[in-house]
Interface confidence: medium
């Protein structure tokens, strides 16, 4: 099942995705799609980027991490209730089925209207499992109680590859090196 | 010595099904990524279905998507290809393959040949 | 998905010359962070299934002669056999396992003239 993170209209969408490069610039190619991850590449791409830079994007969608060390995570500025659905980050490991692949749901929910000014205290206590985080423009929104879910399931599907599958010599040999623990 | 040995090969009618094994032995299945490959008479050689290490990944080449399920026992140390709604042009020699860390194909089963006709 | 293509598809060669077999991909299978080229080559005798000669375009697997030798880089590969034994007949392939799905060349046909 996947990972469910929430915004609202207007706001930017944050959909995390991470990995550890075996040293500074070993990048590892990543794409991010529509739609859940398909059996190769991802469908409806957005965003992709290659061992050296971002080399695909499309307008609203963007990386606000440094993806020079791992953080691959998904920007998606001033979300629309059709950016709801789920999203494909793949990391694109060179080998046979070698890549790590993670579905997200983003959820997107009706901006709320208010007859007045909102004074920040009320608009913590409207949403109290809302957490804003640094970006530019409107204020970039998650589920905090969705936070540890994507590392958790990210930890054990990656414990449970390198460890049954072998993947460690692998991960080593293409040069990425997903740390765990 | 890592062997594998196929079965389950054999004529069957278009819309039929057929379930193709591989027992390994010299090594555990699941220590491994798998693959099956095949190859039509006097044709090359096309990758069809894949299963990464874990077991947690299945991978499919888009001529069969839908139609074919890779599994293993790991009880049992073997390797499976379920194939339903066959279809004549999924005639050929099936290969199970074993996969070498992320990389190429090491080690090949003798081959088992599916024919599918009315 | 990569496309590999070999050329020729079939060729004559007599016993003891030098045989070569050429790979082309699609896309480049050189994965910059390691260096190594995610590319090998099998051998398919009549009735047999391949038999791996070749990895990472150039090392050879144990036990195979060593007459045969691999060499290229990025998309550009050649299969090299230096002196072309009566047992080298056989169809032979080049793979990639860069990126999925795994593709091989059509394969070509190696015989003695």
């Known amino acids: 099942s996947e990972v469910e993170y929430r915004a609202e209209v207007g706001q930017n969408a944050y959909l995390p995705c991470f990995y550890t490069p075996a040293a500074p610039g070993n990048l590892v190619p990543v794409c991010w799609g529509k739609g859940a991850c398909p059996v190769f590449e991802c469908g409806n791409v957005v965003l992709r980027t290659d061992e050296r830079d971002v080399n695909y994007w499309t307008s609203r969608y963007w990386l606000n991490g440094d993806f020079r060390k791992g953080d691959v995570s998904l920007t998606i500025e001033n979300v629309t209730l059709a950016d709801s659905g789920i999203y494909c980050c793949r990391i694109q490991i060179p080998g046979i089925m070698n890549d790590e692949k993670f579905n997200l749901k983003l959820v997107i929910k009706p901006a709320k209207v208010t007859p007045a000014p909102t004074r920040q205290r009320d608009f913590t206590a409207a949403f109290p499992r809302m957490l804003t985080t640094r970006g530019h423009g409107p204020a970039e929104t998650q589920t905090l109680g969705s936070l540890p879910d994507i590392n958790l399931t990210q930890i054990s599907t990656l414990a449970n590859e390198l460890r049954d599958s072998r993947l460690a010599n692998d991960l080593r040999d293409s040069g990425a090196t997903i740390r765990i623990g | 010595q890592m062997q594998l040995q196929q079965s389950g090969g054999g004529l069957v009618q278009p819309g039929g099904s057929l379930r193709l094994s591989c027992a390994a032995s010299?090594?555990?299945?699941?220590?491994?990524?798998m693959s099956w490959v095949r190859q039509a008479l006097g044709k090359g050689l096309e990758w069809v279905s894949g299963?990464?290490?874990?077991?947690?990944?299945?991978y499919y080449a888009d001529s069969v998507k839908g139609r074919f399920t890779i599994s293993r026992d790991n009880s049992k140390n073997t390797l499976y290809l379920q194939m339903n709604s066959l279809r004549a042009e999924d005639t050929a020699v099936y290969y199970c393959?074993?996969?070498?860390?992320?990389?190429?194909?090491?080690?090949w089963g003798q081959g088992t040949l599916v024919t599918v006709s009315s | 998905e990569i496309v590999m293509t070999q050329s020729p598809d079939s060729l004559a060669v007599s016993l003891g010359e030098r045989a070569t077999i050429n790979c082309k991909s699609s896309?480049?299978?050189?994965?910059?962070?390691?260096?190594?080229?995610?590319l090998a080559w099998y051998q398919q005798k009549p009735g047999q299934p391949p038999k791996l000669l070749i990895y990472?375009?150039?090392t050879r697997e144990s036990g195979v002669p060593d007459r045969f030798s691999g060499s290229g880089s990025g998309t550009d590969f050649t299969l090299t056999i230096s002196s072309l034994q009566a047992e080298d007949v056989a169809v032979y392939y080049c793979?990639?396992?860069?990126?999925?799905?795994?593709?091989f060349g059509q394969g070509t046909r190696l015989e003695i003239k």
């Open positions: 010299g090594f555990t299945v699941s220590s491994y990524a």
């Open positions: 990472w375009a150039s």
């Open positions: 299963i990464s290490g874990s077991g947690g990944s299945t």
């Open positions: 393959a074993k996969i070498v860390g992320a990389t190429h194909f090491d080690y």
């Open positions: 896309q480049s299978v050189l994965y910059s962070s390691n260096n190594k080229n995610y």
């Open positions: 793979q990639q396992y860069y990126s999925g799905p795994i593709t």
